[in-house]
C-alpha cells in the first residue's frame, strides 16, 4: 500500500510521544513535499511530479529512492551530497526523466549505492567520470553492483554527427563511463538493452570481471567477432536476443562454452544459414548453455527461412560459389 504523501513517517507522533511520559520527541524526519516517504521501508518515492532537480531535503534514512518520471535534464556533480550524507542509500532509480547530461561525480558521497537505474533517459552527455567520481587513472572502487542503462540512446536528431557516426560516438561515450578509473570492478549486473549498439567496444568486458548478468538485448549487434567473454568467469546470463546477429564464429562459441555457469539467450536474431553456420549448428546440438535453442530459426537465405537451426545438417548449409571478378556485377 502506498505510504501517505509528504507525511513524516516516524512510528510515533510527537503528541503521542509526549503523552507517553518521555521528556522530548525524536526528531521527525522531513519528507520532501513532492514525495512519499516510508521510514519503516526506508523508501522515498518522488514519482511523476515534474521535478526539475533532486529534492534537497531527502531524509537520511533513505535506502531506496525513486525519482522516476520527472523533468530533470541535468544531474550535476554532487547531486546527492547531503549533510549528513545519505549513507544508507542502496538503490537509486532515475529512469524515465529527461536527463541529457550526467556530470562527473554525480553520484559521489553515496558510499552504499549498490543499484543505479538511468534507463529511458536520452543521454547525450554521460561524463566519463559519472560513475568513477574522480578523474584519476585509478579511482576508488565504486560500490555499484547493478547498473541499468536500458534505452539511454538519444533520438537520432539529438545525436552528434548524424546517424552512424553518432552511434559510434554514443557507444564510445558509454564505454568510457564504464571503464573510467577501473571503478566498476565490482559490478555484477549491467543492462544495456535497447540502445541501437552496432558493436560492443572490445575493452569494456575485460574491465568488468565480476559481471554475473549482461543484457545486450534489442540492440543492432551484427557480430561478436571482436568481443571477448573469456575473462567473465562468473557470468551467469548473457542476453543477446533481438539483435542483428548472423552467425557466431568458433572463437565466440569456444569462449561461451568455457564459462562454467553461463546461460545465453539468442532468440530473434536473423541467422544466416549458409556454409558459415556449420560450426554454430554443431555447437548448438551439443551445448546446454543456450536457452530455448530449439526456437532459433534461419532468416536467410530465403530458401532456408524458418528452418530450425538445430535441425540443420552440413548438406543444408551451402554457400553460393563466388563468381570470378570478370563475371561479377556491381
Amino acid at each position: 500500500s502506498a505510504p501517505s504523501s509528504s507525511v513524516p513517517s516516524s512510528s510515533t507522533s510527537p503528541a503521542a510521544f509526549l503523552a507517553s511520559g518521555s521528556a522530548q520527541p525524536p526528531p521527525a524526519e522531513r519528507c520532501p513535499a513532492a514525495c512519499e516517504c516510508s521510514e519503516a521501508a526506508r523508501t522515498v518515492k518522488c514519482v511523476n511530479r515534474n521535478l526539475l532537480e533532486v529534492p534537497a531535503d531527502l531524509p537520511p534514512y533513505v535506502r531506496n529512492l525513486f525519482l522516476t518520471g520527472n523533468q530533470m535534464t541535468v544531474l550535476p556533480a554532487g547531486a546527492f551530497a547531503r549533510q549528513p550524507p545519505l549513507a544508507d542509500l542502496e538503490a537509486l532509480n532515475l529512469s524515465g526523466n529527461h536527463l541529457k547530461e550526467v556530470c562527473a561525480g554525480a553520484f559521489e558521497h553515496l558510499p552504499g549505492l549498490r543499484r543505479l537505474d538511468l534507463s529511458h533517459n536520452p543521454l547525450t552527455n554521460l561524463s566519463a567520470f559519472a560513475f568513477a567520481g574522480s578523474n584519476a587513472s585509478v579511482s576508488a572502487p565504486s560500490p555499484l553492483e547493478e547498473l541499468i542503462l536500458n534505452h539511454i540512446v538519444p533520438p537520432e536528431d539529438q545525436r552528434q554527427n548524424g546517424s552512424f557516426e553518432g552511434m559510434v560516438a554514443f557507444e564510445g561515450m558509454v564505454a568510457a563511463a564504464l571503464l573510467a578509473g577501473r571503478a566498476l570492478q565490482g559490478l555484477r549486473r549491467l543492462e544495456l538493452a535497447s540502445n541501437h549498439f552496432l558493436y560492443l567496444p572490445r575493452d569494456v568486458l575485460a574491465q568488468l570481471p565480476s559481471l554475473r548478468h549482461l543484457d545486450l538485448s534489442n540492440n543492432s549487434l551484427v557480430s561478436l567477432t571482436y568481443v571477448s567473454f573469456r575473462n567473465l568467469t562468473h557470468l551467469e546470463s548473457l542476453h543477446l536476443e533481438d539483435n542483428a546477429l548472423k552467425v557466431l564464429h568458433n572463437g565466440t562459441l569456444a569462449e561461451l562454452q568455457g564459462l562454467p555457469h553461463i546461460r545465453v539467450f539468442l532468440d530473434n536474431n536473423p541467422w544466416v544459414c549458409d556454409c558459415h553456420m556449420a560450426d554454430m549448428v554443431t555447437w548448438l546440438k551439443e551445448t546446454e548453455v543456450v536457452q530455448g535453442k530449439d526456437r532459433l530459426t534461419c532468416a536467410y537465405p530465403e530458401k532456408m527461412r524458418n528452418r530450425v537451426l538445430l535441425e540443420l545438417n552440413s548438406a543444408d548449409l551451402d554457400c553460393d560459389p563466388i563468381l570470378p571478378p570478370s563475371l561479377q556485377t556491381s
Epitope: D242, N268, D294, T297, R307, V308, E311
Partner: antibody
Framework: QGQLQQSGAELMKPGASVKISCRGT????????IEWVKQRPGHGLEWIGE????????YYNEKFKGKATFTADTSSNTAYMQLSSLTSDDSAVYFC?????????WGQGTTLTVSS | DIQMTQTTSSLSASLGDRVTISCRAS??????LNWYQQKPDGTVKLLIY???RLHSGVPSRFSGSGSGTDFSLTISNLEPEDIATYYC?????????FGSGTKLEIK
C-alpha cells in the same frame, strides 16, 4: 513449396476428446515448427501453441494449457492436436501452419462442432 | 501478452483505390510483424513478413511499413481478388498474438 493437409470436420459431444491431424508435404517436415491456431465463428485468429516435430519440443499459450496437447510423427510427416473435455467454447475452425518467424503455409482448417 | 489492435474492423473501397490498413502493438515489437490474408472461403495466406518483406508469390501491389508499435499494410491498386479479411500478427514474444482483423469490401 510446402503444403499442409488437415483432417476433416468433426462433430463431438461435450466432455469428449478429439484429435485433429495435419500432414506436411513438399518440405523437410521435422525442421519447421507446426503452429496451431483457433478461429471461432465471427472471431479473429488465436494462437494455441506449436510443436517442433524433429525434437518434440512444444510451447503452449497459457490459455490452452490443459486443453490442447500436441504430438508429431516424423515417419508420416504428421502433427496432431488433441483437445480434451470439449465444451461449446471449443467449437471453432482449427488451423495448422508451418511456423518460425512467420506462418508461411497454412492448412485448409478443420471445423470442430461440439454439441449434445 | 502483447495486444495487437486493428481499430478499423471493416473498410469499403473501390477497385483501383489505394487502401491502407493499420495495426498497433501494445508495446514495442521492433519489426517483428506479419500480415495475413483470409479469403471468404477461409483460406489463409502470408502476405508480408518482418513488417515489409513480401512473401513469395504475393503481388507487388501489397506493401508493409512501420516499426515499434505502429504498422500498416497498403494495397496500392485494389483488385477484386483482394476482398478478404487482413490480420496483423506479432512474433516478438510468446504467445504470438493477432489483431482482430480488418474486413475489406468493394464499394
Amino acid at each position: 513449396q510446402g503444403q499442409l493437409q488437415q483432417s476433416g470436420a468433426e462433430l463431438m459431444k461435450p466432455g469428449a476428446s478429439v484429435k485433429i491431424s495435419c500432414r506436411g508435404t513438399g518440405y523437410t517436415f521435422r525442421s519447421y515448427w507446426i503452429e496451431w491456431v483457433k478461429q471461432r465463428p465471427g472471431h479473429g485468429l488465436e494462437w494455441i501453441g506449436e510443436i517442433l516435430p524433429g525434437i518434440g519440443s512444444t510451447y503452449y499459450n497459457e490459455k490452452f494449457k490443459g486443453k490442447a496437447t500436441f504430438t508429431a510423427d516424423t515417419s508420416s510427416n504428421t502433427a496432431y492436436m488433441q483437445l480434451s473435455s470439449l465444451t461449446s467454447d471449443d467449437s471453432a475452425v482449427y488451423f495448422c501452419a508451418r511456423g518460425g518467424r512467420d506462418f508461411d503455409y497454412w492448412g485448409q482448417g478443420t471445423t470442430l462442432t461440439v454439441s449434445s | 501478452d502483447i495486444q495487437m489492435t486493428q481499430t478499423t474492423s471493416s473498410l469499403s473501397a473501390s477497385l483501383g483505390d489505394r487502401v491502407t490498413i493499420s495495426c498497433r502493438a501494445s508495446q514495442d515489437i521492433n519489426n517483428y510483424l506479419n500480415w495475413y490474408q483470409q479469403k471468404p472461403d477461409g483460406t489463409v495466406k502470408l502476405l508480408i513478413y518482418d513488417t515489409s518483406r513480401l512473401h513469395s508469390g504475393v503481388p507487388s501491389r501489397f506493401s508493409g511499413s512501420g516499426s515499434g508499435t505502429d504498422f500498416s499494410l497498403t494495397i496500392s491498386n485494389l483488385e477484386p481478388e483482394d476482398i478478404a479479411t487482413y490480420y496483423c500478427q506479432q512474433y516478438s514474444k510468446l504467445p504470438y498474438t493477432f489483431g482482430s482483423g480488418t474486413k475489406l469490401e468493394i464499394k
